[in-house]
């Protein structure tokens, strides 16, 4: 199997009460304008063939998307929530900038790629189920990379 | 509509072995996962795992580990769980829930089937 | 394993009162808290995902609140159809803990 390194975030990360709850508030406050309550972006599909050790690149690779193809995009919506949510997720995402796999990723690429396929073709639809999912998004990062 | 229908009520012999089936209906099978919960005369709701019908992934209760397993068959939108070596105290009625695994809650729910343990 | 802790065990009201439900988890959840109701003979409903959200079909009466160990489901004014047994759910990341449950009966 491939190996991950640097793919490590420190447990103090998701142990600041103040921005997890906005973080939380946040995904609540989009998902409340989410009507495509069938279709999952984080769940178990995405990380399906990926082995725990993978995870964290995975979930780095999910993070940066999201930051750059959604929040950023969208980064005037779901004020006041918005503006400090981004720049805790931004600090994560520079955390990880050193988190890589030596050897073959084409299948979390894969796992990726579908994942923002799904958020391309439900258009601004998809980037809010994105943002409402920000609590899975924390979830994952948590239980992937600590 | 989204519905699930379990199998008839069962009475077994304590040792013995039951299956029981959760027929999905109404939305896309491999898009969910089904849970297990399950509740004895008079006492509350257990829950007895999980079983992703996209996968075919299980995730089981620590107090059921090694006596049940659960699969699904996506051909048929079925979902089964097996218990075995049954006792008494495993007489009670057997749950069904739709469940996506991942921080989901059980939005449907089966009828309900009643197992009935006795020599 | 997380334990959930729901108290009253059973706790008796009359029509129109507005009556608050507790729920404790052993550690730190976050916001991965459900409600169900369910009444004799039948299979539970689904009325609050997590924790504060409400379930399709449910009554808009029903709402709930909490974050990280503590939680409430609040009926903001009881009807003859809320008389029932609840009971509080941890949704985990391949796994549940259901709650005792709490029995709410006619005064």
């Known amino acids: 199997a491939p190996i991950s390194s640097h793919c490590r975030l420190d447990k103090s990360n998701f142990q600041q009460p103040y921005i997890t709850n906005r973080t939380f508030m946040l995904a609540k406050e989009a998902s409340l304008a989410d009507n495509n309550t069938d279709v999952r972006l984080i769940g178990e599909k995405l990380f399906h063939g990926v082995s725990m050790s993978e995870r964290c690149y995975l979930m780095k690779q999910v993070l940066n998307f999201t930051l750059e193809e959604v929040l950023f995009p969208q980064s005037d919506r779901f004020q006041p929530y918005m503006q400090e949510v981004v720049p805790f997720l931004a600090r994560l995402s520079n955390r990880l900038s050193t988190c890589h796999i030596e050897g073959d990723d084409l299948h979390i690429q894969r796992n990726v790629q579908k994942l923002k396929d799904t958020v391309k073709k439900l258009g601004e639809s998809g980037e809010i189920k994105a943002i409402g999912e920000l609590d899975l998004l924390f979830m994952s990062l948590r239980n992937a990379c600590i | 509509q989204v519905q699930l229908v379990e199998s008839g009520a069962e009475v077994k012999k304590p040792g013995a072995s039951v299956k029981v089936s959760c027929k999905a209906s109404g939305y896309t099978f491999t898009s969910y996962g089904i849970s297990w919960v399950r509740q004895a005369p008079g006492q509350g709701l257990e829950w007895m795992g999980w079983?992703?019908?996209?996968?075919?992934?299980?995730n089981y209760a620590q107090k059921f580990q090694g006596r049940v397993t659960m699969t699904t068959d996506t051909s048929t939108s079925t979902a089964y769980m097996e218990l075995r070596g049954l006792r008494s105290d495993d007489t009670a009625v057997y749950y069904c829930a739709r469940d996506r695994g991942y921080y989901d809650a059980f939005d449907i729910w089966g009828q309900g089937t009643l197992v009935t343990v006795s020599s | 394993d997380i334990q959930m802790t729901q108290s009253p065990s059973t706790l008796s009201a009359s029509i129109g009162d507005r009556v608050t439900i507790t729920c404790r988890a052993s550690e730190g959840i976050y916001h991965w808290l459900a409600w169900y109701q369910q009444k004799p003979g039948k299979a539970p409903k689904l009325l609050i995902y997590k924790a504060s959200s409400l379930a399709s079909g449910a009554p808009s009466r029903f709402s709930g609140s909490g974050f990280g160990t503590d939680f409430t489901l609040t009926i903001s004014s009881l009807q003859p159809d809320d008389f029932a047994t609840y009971y509080c759910q941890q949704m985990g990341e391949y796994n549940a803990t259901i709650g005792g449950g709490t029995k709410l009966e006619i005064k």
């Open positions: 079983v992703s019908a996209y996968t075919g992934n299980t």
